[in-house]
């Protein structure tokens, strides 16, 4: 019963933090404008992994697709690749995970199987889940960089008359979505792989009973009974469901509404 | 067709308030910011302060805090200034104005003078 | 607050000649987000409300005639008049729409030499 519920937990949780790392890779508030120096701005800028954003007093936002792979810098490009394959292998993961779960009964699958699967699932939310912190983690840095940088050369005087304020970029909301995502696909995979050796039947060799009867005698031996845990020679070949994500640049989105000042 | 319809010139006392309104038709009323502008005879523009009709989000000329309070009233389409502790100096002609793209005030009232004997 | 200063105060142009208005920030109305001068022109005549001529810097606003131009970048803009015609003797406001608060150049009176 505890094995159930650990591995049907690990599962919910798993798929709630990818449903997570889902939203953060689409979010187009990774890096928002600061506003420290100017709390109420006129013209807000905000940015993504596909594209950046420009939202007015007026109430319209302005977003344009970032439209070329070479002009992108090396590390938004390593960032949509973490949290790419961090989607891919959760995606592959809970397919597996589904096939896995104690509550859901296919065939005359074995424990030993669900067992091997439902590891397996729990492997690929830890590796999903590592990717997505690595990645979110990889961006904070480059922002933190990039913060430390514009602030040294923030105010550059012409004749000492007229300022030009370099834009200042700090973390936005979808850093913050994807490091829980991330924590949450993680911990999901640590409750499977935890949920997998319950499931794996022990291996338990009974030893022989004679029983002396009147009149003649039988011996009950019951044959050592060996359950394979998946691991050994003995597993069975089973096709692990193989997904694949697929992302495409955003389409250049024309002026949106937007709800606030 | 846009339309923004200001009420009537206003006479008051000093120390006195007057509310001003902008009842806007021909457009999604919650779907652009309204803007009001002040003009002193012979002078220049001077930005009061901003509203989103949408959810009645406010940004002030700190100049004019204090002195502006804008509302709005969605189920009439209206957008309202109120201003208090009316001075001499207040005399003006008050503008409501649609802003569009860019932040530009693509659409105005005819505008609605604002009196107030020294 | 952004300061914005136009130039000339005043200005007296024969019809069909060319009128040039300029206006100056005391900061940088470019957004880096877009690559868009948040700089806007205005002409009021007497009476009456002012009309957005120009936003952008250089976007001419429907119903515009092309006759009115804004270009400009950064901290230095200029509205043209490549012909003038007897309804374009006005003032002419420009406006930072950048930063809070607004801001208004003091206005630039045409008139008819």
């Known amino acids: 019963m505890a094995v159930t519920a650990c591995q049907g937990l690990g599962f919910v949780v798993s798929l709630i933090g990818i449903a997570g790392i889902i939203a953060a890779t689409c979010m187009d508030q990774w890096s928002t404008q600061d506003l420290y120096n100017n709390p109420v701005t006129a013209v807000f800028n905000y940015q993504g992994l596909w594209r950046s954003c420009v939202r007015e007093s007026s109430g319209f936002t302005e977003c344009r697709g970032y439209f070329t792979l070479l002009g992108l810098p090396a590390m938004l490009q390593a960032v949509r690749a973490l949290m790419i394959v961090g989607i891919v292998l959760g995606a592959i993961g809970l397919l597996v995970s589904i096939f896995a779960l104690k509550c859901i009964r296919i065939g005359s699958m074995e424990d030993s199987a669900k067992a091997n699967m439902t590891l397996t699932s729990g492997i690929m939310f830890i590796v999903s889940g590592l990717c997505a912190i690595a990645g979110v983690s990889v961006f904070a840095n480059m922002l933190v960089t990039n913060f430390w940088m514009s602030t040294a050369n923030m105010y550059t005087g012409m004749g000492g008359m007229v300022q030009t304020v370099q834009t200042r970029y700090t973390f936005g909301a979808a850093l913050f979505v994807g490091w829980v995502a991330g924590g949450l696909t993680l911990i999901g995979g640590v409750m499977m792989c935890i949920a997998c050796r319950g499931l794996a039947p022990e291996e338990t060799n009974y030893k022989a009973v004679s029983y002396h009867a009147s009149g003649h005698s039988v011996a009950y031996k019951p044959g050592g009974f060996k359950a394979s845990t998946g691991f050994g020679s003995n597993t069975k070949n089973k096709k692990i469901y193989d997904g694949g994500a697929r992302t495409e640049d955003e389409v250049q989105s024309y002026p949106s509404k937007h709800d606030y000042v | 067709e846009v339309q923004l319809q200001q009420s009537g010139a206003e006479v008051k006392k000093p120390g006195a308030s007057v509310k001003v309104s902008c009842k806007a038709s021909?457009?999604?009323?919650?779907?652009?910011?309204m803007n009001w502008v002040k003009q002193a005879p012979g002078q220049g523009l001077e930005w009061i302060g901003l509203?989103?009709?949408?959810?009645?989000?406010?940004s002030y000329n700190q100049k004019f805090q204090g002195k502006a309070t804008l509302t709005v009233d969605k189920s009439s389409s209206t957008a309202y200034m109120e201003l208090s502790r009316l001075r001499s100096e207040d005399s003006a002609v008050y503008y409501c104005?649609?802003?569009?793209?860019?932040?530009?005030?693509?659409?105005w009232g005819a505008g609605t003078t604002v009196t107030v004997p020294s | 607050d952004i300061v914005m200063t136009q130039s000339p105060d005043s200005l007296a142009v024969s019809l069909g000649e060319r009128a040039t208005i300029n206006c100056k920030s005391s900061?940088?109305?470019?957004?880096?987000?877009?690559?868009?001068?948040?700089l806007t022109w205005y002409q009021q005549k007497p009476g009456q409300p002012p009309k957005l001529l120009i936003y952008?810097?250089?976007t001419r606003e429907s119903g515009v005639p092309d006759r009115f131009s804004g270009s400009g970048s950064g901290t230095d803009f200029t509205l043209t008049i490549s012909s003038l015609q007897a309804e374009d003797v006005a003032v002419y406001y420009c406006?930072?729409?950048?930063?809070?608060?607004?801001?208004f150049g003091a206005g630039t009176k045409l008139e008819l030499k």
């Open positions: 104005a649609r802003m569009n793209y860019g932040n530009a005030m693509d659409y």
């Open positions: 021909g457009y999604s009323f919650t779907g652009y910011t």
């Open positions: 509203i989103n009709p949408y959810n009645g989000g406010t």
């Open positions: 900061q940088s109305l470019l957004n880096s987000g877009n690559q868009k001068n948040y």
């Open positions: 952008w810097a250089s």
């Open positions: 406006q930072n729409d950048y930063s809070y608060p607004l801001t």
